[in-house]
């Protein structure tokens, strides 16, 4: 057992198995569930994380299903199909041959159908609105301090370039974080806003995906910012296609 083996971990994803058996004896980590090699210098894709989450033994799973407040991601957890790059496949099906189309964050964007359902392309989610409600504090947070702290968090913890944090809105006790990232804006190596939002969501729930790190300790000028509920809204580059029946 060498020091190299001790070093061979995945700082950004604890749901991996790592060993120094990569090219030239380099460290290589594979995601649980899919066995796909992951890049541990950045966030793992939400698709691979969901797959790993679903592969964990039921009795060992300390993770919770999304709360009843998850208005947008109504379908909650499922075992997704991921492409070779770890992205969601446009069409997802369950074991009973019920299929549906998803966007780039894996959220259903059509009615459910059968195996004949066609999903021509993976539609990109280019705008994410994270709606938070914080616990009561002695006074309101200073807006510019809050803005700076959340931008810092997304850069330093989730590796997201500050240009993709479009705005931080605050009306006590509601905080809204707007993430925007068009296909044309996202360069190779850029963290996807959907992955950053998912890591943040899991952090807020106390289910950090980072290896051996403490949970999220969010403070604004030393004052703890404790979140009591989260809603995440996803806007796609092409509007979703639901029947009127669902809308009623």
């Amino acid at each position: 057992h060498t020091a190299a083996q001790d070093n061979c971990t995945c700082p950004t994803n604890k749901m991996t198995v790592c060993s120094p058996d990569g090219p030239g004896g380099r460290c290589q980590c594979r995601a649980l569930g899919s066995g796909m090699a992951v890049d541990c210098s950045t966030l793992t894709s939400k698709c691979l994380l969901l797959k790993a989450r679903m592969s964990a033994p039921k009795n060992a799973r300390t993770l919770v299903r999304p709360s009843e407040h998850a208005l947008v991601d109504n379908d909650g957890l499922y075992d997704p199909d991921c492409d070779p790059e770890g992205r969601f496949k446009a069409r997802q099906c369950n074991q009973t041959s019920v299929c549906w189309c998803v966007n780039s964050v894996g959220v259903r964007r059509t009615d459910k159908g059968d195996l004949s359902l066609r999903c021509d392309e993976l539609v990109r989610t280019h705008h994410i609105l994270i709606d938070l409600r914080h616990r009561p504090t002695a006074g309101a947070f200073n807006h510019s301090d809050l803005d700076a702290e959340l931008r810092r968090l997304f850069r330093e913890r989730y590796r997201l370039h500050p240009k993709f944090v479009a705005a931080v809105h605050y009306e006590q006790p509601t905080i809204q974080i707007e993430l925007r990232q068009n296909t044309s804006q996202k360069a190779a190596g850029d963290v996807d806003i959907g992955d950053a939002a998912y890591y943040f969501e899991r952090d807020i729930k106390g289910e950090s995906l980072f290896q051996g790190r403490g949970g999220l300790d969010l403070r604004v000028r030393g004052e703890p910012l404790q979140v009591e509920r989260t809603l995440i809204y996803y806007l796609d580059e092409i509007p979703p296609k639901f029947s009127m029946k669902r809308l009623t």
């Epitope: 020091a3 070093n7 700082p11 380099r26 980590c29 210098s41 850069r155 590796r159 370039h161």
Partner: antibody, heavy 122, light 109 residues
């Protein structure tokens, strides 16, 4: 723990070369970043490229270095920098350095090699 | 993105104090390092995280600041402090920009 660069020397304009950075007393198979930085005679420090030596091999390049410089890590003991189409402006001491954290955006260099001099001249 | 370091050169007597400033064109939180480089040697890390002293660095070296304005203060100057000092950040490395300041030469009289 030490780093050592090799491969420097005299190169003709438009020529190419490969610089190698080897570590001793530690293994590159960890969760950190390796960096190449250069310094022209009497000038300041200039970042060229960085590579993650854990699982993944992510790379970043200075805008001016893209296409002409290639950083790679094919083993757990060495990082290389390939340079092409060299000009007199590339004459410099080339350093490799080890980043102290696994987060590329919060990195600082706690271990440096002594540097290798590259002279581009006909 | 740019790191602007001032002054480019400073001269102070032994026992004096030198202050070097580094300004980032964008907010980099506290992600700044300071290095000392002597002729013919590689740089040596002095301070990281804007204010944390690297191992083995004397407490005469002090870093401060956050956001866009940073300062390195060297007090009780010694002859051995004569060197060039650089600030550095990697916060915007994905923009392909050089994160090093231009350097400050410190001459000890």
């Amino acid at each position: 723990q030490q780093l050592e660069e090799s491969g420097g020397g005299l190169v003709k304009p438009e020529g190419s070369l490969t610089l190698t950075c080897k570590g001793s007393g530690f293994d590159f198979s960890g969760t950190y970043w390796m960096w190449w930085v250069r310094q022209a005679p009497g000038k300041g420090l200039e970042w060229i490229a960085s590579i993650y030596v854990g699982s993944g091999s992510s790379t970043y390049y200075a805008s001016w270095a893209k296409g002409r410089f290639t950083i790679s890590s094919t083993s757990s003991t060495a990082v290389t920098l390939q340079a092409t189409s060299l000009t007199a402006a590339d004459t410099a001491t080339y350093f490799c350095a080890r980043g102290a954290t696994n987060n590329v955006f919060m990195n600082y260099f706690n271990l440096w090699g002594p540097g290798t001099l590259v002279t581009v001249s006909s | 993105f740019e790191m602007t370091q001032t002054p480019s050169s400073v001269s102070e007597p032994v026992g004096g104090t030198v202050t070097i400033k580094c300004q980032a064109s964008e907010d980099i939180s506290s992600n700044l390092g300071w290095y000392q480089q002597k002729p013919g040697q590689p740089p040596k890390l002095l301070i990281y995280g804007a204010s944390t002293l690297a191992s083995g660095v004397p407490s005469r070296f002090k870093g401060s600041g956050s956001g866009t304005e940073f300062t390195l203060t060297i007090s009780d100057l010694e002859a051995a402090d004569a060197a060039t000092y650089y600030c550095q950040t990697s916060y915007y490395i994905d923009d392909g920009v050089n994160g090093f300041g231009g350097g400050t030469e410190v001459v000890v009289k």
